[in-house]
């Protein structure tokens, strides 16, 4: 078994009594249907629970829903269904919770056929009160809040109209018809695609991309022949149809669509797709699908403009458009991402990068673990992580990998140890250093969550039988205690804790089944008495992230700087607390060739840090189209990696000259753009 799992760890004294005093049961007065849960605001303790129950009758479906509210992190719930006039709420729209701590909630109601429009219930006081509002349209999508102003909402109607409200859903205005997709950008800007002829589907590849910066008073067409668009970090991407054939290419803008540049990425055909895997203000990870139904493609990483791309990873597993990929941002350590590749023999292997896609490697085999049947050499193998793809294939994997920004270095995931992902029952593994080293944490599949910024890890065994036991660890998964939270086992459906991993409360959701009825039930456990005291300075120890060789002066340098963190000692049983702030001390590193990516017209041969000219461009002037002007590039082949902060050391020369010649970035030329006002 995993270390400490069956062992009396002796770290936490009298925990049964402490937890028993802090375990709160709530039985919901509902027939079992579906249940959805939303947190309203941050550190408010407010939870909304919507239960729905469908009875399919011969002619129609009769539905009933109930709304419950807690303001103490789920310890107690109050039935507030009367606040929404006992109306049936449409679960497919969920509960639209406002950004930040706005306290706003929108619920979309089911209305009878033939009505003029839909109906919503709005709250701006953390669901203490609701206002009923009848809509002049039937919503097709959930209401979308502007990230900058939670009073501004947008929605698409079933008639493909784009509707906007400026007063939190009180009054609505249709600002455009024939809209396929709409998204909020920055500064309350709305981007949307429109069709001219038949429909969104019929006009795919002939759509227009529009922008309004004043909530529909005026518009600008910023792109034509559009297939789709996306926003990532500060980048706006559009996939655009080619003039001559059915291929399309990615164009990118960093000025809200005023000017466009063609991304140096392969074009894709009708059956292929592009996907933004991750993006921040510095760069983007882009997946480009391979031709044919291969189930894989290539990951490219961009420069700081989103234009020049370096090949990052071949044979990247991504099944179909909108399908499954295991690509995971490890949020507990800068620069770390995990994903899966499909190898030549069709087995799936996990890869990890510690430097934002610069290099990928296999995950180190956990110490004291055996290689499984997939391994050719029983002494040499790797850890392979189960993520979205495994879950979609109905393997016995209840959860995707978990990491939290404020639980530095901690990554928890299901996995197997061998040459490839195994279909056998997985175990749970933990890394405390952002994925460099791994340890088996729990035997068999579990649900898991992080509390108190990593001070507590909670797990529940994944079982088809009713359960009544929860496991917890106060030392980053090395030692486990078990607590029986109820005498009567329940059919477990999920673990819920406040997003952000700062809470010390965990809610266990499930249902009880008796001869005639089944009811929803939740148990909320507060761990505050387990972590009796607040952590002090002596409870923390220094940890250098990305350290692989203490003797190397550049040890820990990733993207041009290293970071030392204060980490909680595994032996300290104390509260980080809700106000815990990660303490880190960065220091700048000297530049090396590793801090540069290959510039336009250059590439890196395998296992070489030097960039060499692409043979087909040797001796040619490097001229390319940028923001609608032709540019001449003088370079020795290097461009600093986005977000890299190194100084001194190696300093390759780079100069871009504006040739003062107009050029069109293929299909998105400024000449084709037009504006209009309402």
């Amino acid at each position: 078994s995993a270390p400490g799992e069956d062992e009396e760890c002796g770290r936490v004294r009298d925990f049964v009594a402490k937890l028993a005093n802090n375990t709160h049961q709530h039985v919901f007065d509902d027939l079992r249907g579906s249940v959805s849960l939303s947190w309203v605001g941050d550190s408010t303790g407010v939870i909304l629970v919507l239960t729905t129950f469908h009875v399919p009758l011969v002619i129609m479906t009769f539905g009933q829903s109930k709304l419950y509210r807690s303001e103490d992190y789920g310890k107690n719930f109050k039935d507030i269904t009367d606040l929404i006039n006992n109306t049936f709420i449409r679960t497919e729209f969920g509960m639209a919770i406002g950004p930040e701590n706005s306290g706003k909630v929108v619920l979309t109601a089911e209305v009878s056929g033939g009505s003029r429009g839909g109906r919503i219930f709005r709250s701006s006081d953390f669901a203490k009160n609701f206002v009923q509002t009848d809509l002049p349209f039937h919503p097709l999508t959930q209401m979308m809040y502007s990230p900058q102003n939670s009073d501004y909402l947008l929605a698409l109607s079933t008639e493909n109209g784009l509707w906007v409200s400026k007063n939190f859903g009180g009054k609505w205005e249709e600002i455009h018809k024939a809209v396929c997709l709409a998204k909020w950008g920055s500064d309350n800007t709305i981007f949307f695609t429109t069709y001219a002829n038949g429909s969104c589907k019929a006009d795919l590849g002939a759509l227009e991309l529009w922008r309004t910066s004043d909530l529909g008073k005026s518009f600008k067409t910023i792109g034509v022949k559009i297939y789709s668009f996306g926003l990532g970090g500060r980048f706006l991407f559009a996939s655009v149809m080619a003039d001559k054939d059915t291929t399309r290419r990615i164009h990118v803008s960093t000025d809200q669509g005023d000017t466009w540049s063609m991304a140096q990425l392969p074009s894709v055909g009708q059956e292929q797709f592009y996907s933004i895997l991750a993006a921040n203000d510095d760069m983007v990870f882009m997946h480009v699908d391979e031709p044919g139904d291969t189930g894989f493609g290539t990951i490219f990483t961009s420069d700081d403009r989103g234009i020049v791309y370096s090949k990052s990873l071949d044979r990247h597993l991504y099944t179909t458009t909108g399908g499954e990929t295991d690509f995971t941002n490890v949020t507990s350590l800068r620069g770390v991402y995990i994903t899966s590749v499909l190898s030549e023999d069709n087995s799936i292997q996990t890869m990890i990068t510690f430097d934002q896609g610069g290099r990928w490697t296999h995950l180190r085999k956990p110490e004291n673990s055996e290689c499984d049947a997939t391994a050719k050499n029983k002494n040499e193998c790797s850890l392979h992580i189960h993520a979205s793809y495994s879950i979609s294939q109905k393997l016995n994997v209840p959860m995707a990998p978990l990491s939290e920004p404020n639980a530095v270095g901690i990554v928890i995931a299901h996995g197997s140890v061998g040459d490839a992902i195994s279909v056998m029952v997985p175990d749970v593994y933990i890394s405390d250093d952002g994925g460099y080293s791994w340890t088996k944490m729990l035997e068999g599949p579990h649900y898991y969550t992080i509390l108190d910024s990593g001070g507590i890890i909670v797990a529940i065994e994944h079982s088809s039988r009713p359960i009544n036991v929860i496991k917890f660890s106060t030392d980053e998964g090395q030692c486990w205690q078990t607590y029986t939270f109820t005498r009567d086992p329940i059919y477990f459906t999920g673990l819920a804790s406040e997003p952000g991993a700062r809470s010390m409360n965990i809610s266990i959701w499930g249902f009880t089944e008796s001869f005639l009825t089944s009811q929803w039930v939740s148990y909320t456990i507060d761990f505050k008495d387990i972590l009796e005291r607040n952590c002090e300075e002596k409870d923390y120890t220094i940890w250098l992230a990305h350290s692989t060789d203490p003797e190397d002066y550049e040890d820990g340098c990733i993207l041009g700087y290293k970071e030392q963190f204060l980490r909680l000692r595994k032996s300290s049983v104390c509260q980080n607390g809700r106000d815990y702030v990660v303490t880190k001390q960065p220091s700048i590193c000297l530049c090396s060739l590793e801090d540069f990516l290959c510039d336009f017209g250059y590439y890196r041969p395998e296992n070489d840090s030097k960039c060499v000219e692409q043979p087909e461009l040797k001796g040619h002037d490097l001229e390319f189209c940028l923001y609608g002007r032709e540019e001449h590039l003088t370079t020795n082949g290097y461009r600093k990696i986005p977000g890299d902060k190194c100084q001194g050391g190696v300093n390759p020369v780079r100069e871009v000259k504006d040739l003062k010649k107009k050029c069109t970035s293929n299909f998105l030329s400024p000449e084709k753009q037009n504006s209009k006002s309402n």
């Epitope: 760890c9 770290r11 030692c479 820990g556 000692r569 595994k570 032996s571």
Partner: antibody, heavy 124, light 107 residues
Framework: QVQLVQSGAEVKKPGASVKVSCKAS????????MHWVRQAPGQGLEWMGW????????MYAQKFQGRVTMTRDTSISTAYMELSRLRSDDTAVYYC?????????????????WGQGTTVTVSS | DIQMTQSPSSLSASVGDRVTITCRAS??????LNWYQQKPGKAPKLLIY???SLQSGVPSRFSGSGSGTDFTLTISSLQPEDFATYYC?????????FGGGTKVEIK
């Protein structure tokens, strides 16, 4: 090669202070904690504390708090341990020892390089 | 402070014998347990760190096991140069503490 060279033996009177030095060579001095451990004649090992040469931060065993001061001089890769208000039961061999590191952790993995030891005799 | 109890305090063995020394912590120290060898007049030498990892340069006849509170150092085949005193040490909680030592003597 990696080594720690300590200062020579000392004879002190009760109530006096002693300062033992430990010069590191063959490795990056600031990359590892320096521990101090003592061993009384015929007895076992007793940990006194550590100094972080990078920051100068220290951690002392409660038993020596207020009597011990651990410092370092990075320019000459040397760590120091000063023990004041000496008593006869402070007679011991004092060792400096480098803390072993593991993937970014400075503590928890033992002490992999030791000095030759400095004998301190406290006698009136 | 965490107490480290080593047993036996001394043992006599012959060359080629399998020797086992145990160390018990007064509370769980997970795997933060290290083993040292010390010969008379010399500084201690790290043999095993993190309960079971062999320090580089140490012969493979030395091995460590255990987790939580109970730990073991095993010498699979005792060699003449192995006659010494062995100490366990916990490095989980400050203050770091050592066991009382086990003296391995020639039978």
């Amino acid at each position: 090669q990696v080594q720690l060279v300590q200062s020579g033996a000392e004879v002190k009177k009760p109530g006096a202070s002693v300062k033992v030095s430990c010069k590191a060579s063959g490795y990056t001095f600031t990359a590892y904690y320096m521990h101090w451990v003592r061993q009384a004649p015929g007895q076992g090992l007793e940990w006194m504390g550590w100094v972080n040469p990078n920051s100068g931060g220290t951690m002392y065993a409660q038993k020596f708090q207020g009597r011990v001061t651990m410092t370092r001089d990075t320019s000459i890769s040397t760590a120091y341990m000063e023990l004041s208000r000496l008593r006869s039961d402070d007679t011991a061999v004092y060792y400096c020892a480098r803390g072993k590191r593991s993937s970014g952790w400075y503590e928890g993995y033992g002490m992999d390089v030791w000095g030759q030891g400095t004998t301190v005799t406290v006698s009136s | 402070d965490i107490q480290m109890t080593q047993s036996p305090s001394s043992l006599s063995a012959s060359v080629g014998d399998r020797v086992t020394i145990t160390c018990r912590a007064s509370q769980s120290i997970s795997s933060y347990l290290n083993w040292y060898q010390q010969k008379p007049g010399k500084a201690p030498k790290l043999l095993i760190y993190a309960a079971s990892s062999l320090q580089s340069g140490v012969p493979s006849r030395f091995s460590g096991s255990g987790s939580g509170t109970d730990f073991t150092l095993t010498i699979s085949s005792l060699q003449p140069e192995d006659f010494a005193t062995y100490y366990c040490q916990q490095s989980d909680v400050s203050p770091i503490t050592f066991g009382g030592g086990t003296k391995v003597e020639i039978k």
